[in-house]
């Protein structure tokens, strides 16, 4: 899906009034300096992407984190804010198997959401020169 | 299994109201996002509102200040009240429960058809 024509503003507001906060909740307990960022983005589209990889796609260590509080956030802010996004993602999920696992935190998980923030900071932020 | 099954819609006159109801079972609400979207003919389903299990809710612009989303977990139902309504809300509006197996895998409803016309 090309992010290119979301209405960023309302994302980030809605970022900014709840899915911040979710995140910041997941992460309680947690140093903010336990994790270094390495995932980066240059732009909005670009930061929408990569948070939307991270937020839905599973990796090694850390299985889903679509249960949590803030992907469904982040999936229905896309959903309302980018033309298009829910009906290309209904087509391409038409076949998807329903099993629910069971929620479980681990350190991995933890990393990429500490990611996530960064990814979400940046995004918030797009008039900044990438360092 | 997961069924949704919406009732509510109906023939209303521009600037009045209606309240779309959705029954859900197979799940609890406590623990899902729930949706409305609505598609209108010759156009894509799009997601108008939605509401998460700690009470917080989204908005699409086309219907913020009209519509209310609300869930009452007891009854396992969750409600849309559409007040003002325009001719350009006449749609089939469908319940949807996030399915959280990843992007947009919603398990959806049967749809209910809402007609604003004089």
């Known amino acids: 899906y090309d992010f290119t024509n979301c209405d960023f503003e309302k994302i980030k507001a809605a970022y900014l009034s709840t899915i911040s906060k979710d995140l910041i909740t997941y992460m309680s307990g947690t140093k903010s300096t336990e994790f270094n960022n390495t995932v980066s983005c240059s732009n909005r589209p670009h930061c929408l992407t990569e948070i939307q990889s991270l937020t839905f796609n599973p990796t090694a260590g850390c299985a889903s984190l679509a249960k949590e509080m803030f992907a469904m956030k982040t999936k229905a802010a896309l959903a309302i804010w980018c033309p298009g996004y829910s009906e290309t993602q209904i087509n391409a999920t038409q076949a998807m198997k329903k099993r629910r696992k069971r929620k479980v935190t681990t350190n991995k998980c933890l990393e990429q959401v500490s990611q996530l923030q960064g990814l979400w900071r940046r995004f918030n932020r797009p008039l900044l020169k990438q360092q | 299994e997961v069924q949704l099954v919406e009732s509510g819609g109906g023939l209303v006159q521009p600037g009045g109201s209606l309240r779309l109801s959705c029954a859900a079972s197979?799940?609890?609400?406590?623990?899902?996002?729930m949706g409305w979207f609505r598609q209108a003919p010759g156009k894509e389903r799009e997601l108008v509102s939605a509401?998460?299990?700690?009470?917080?809710?989204l908005y699409a612009d086309s219907v913020k200040g009209r519509f209310t989303i609300s869930a009452d977990n007891s009854k396992n139902t969750a409600y849309l009240q559409m007040n003002s309504l325009k001719p350009e809300d006449t749609a089939v509006y469908y319940c949807?429960?996030?399915?959280?197996?990843?992007?947009?895998?919603?398990?959806w409803g049967q749809g209910t058809l809402v007609t604003v016309s004089s």
């Open positions: 197979g799940f609890s609400l406590d623990y899902y996002a």
């Open positions: 949807a429960k996030d399915r959280d197996t990843g992007i947009g895998a919603y398990d």
């Open positions: 509401i998460f299990s700690d009470g917080s809710a």
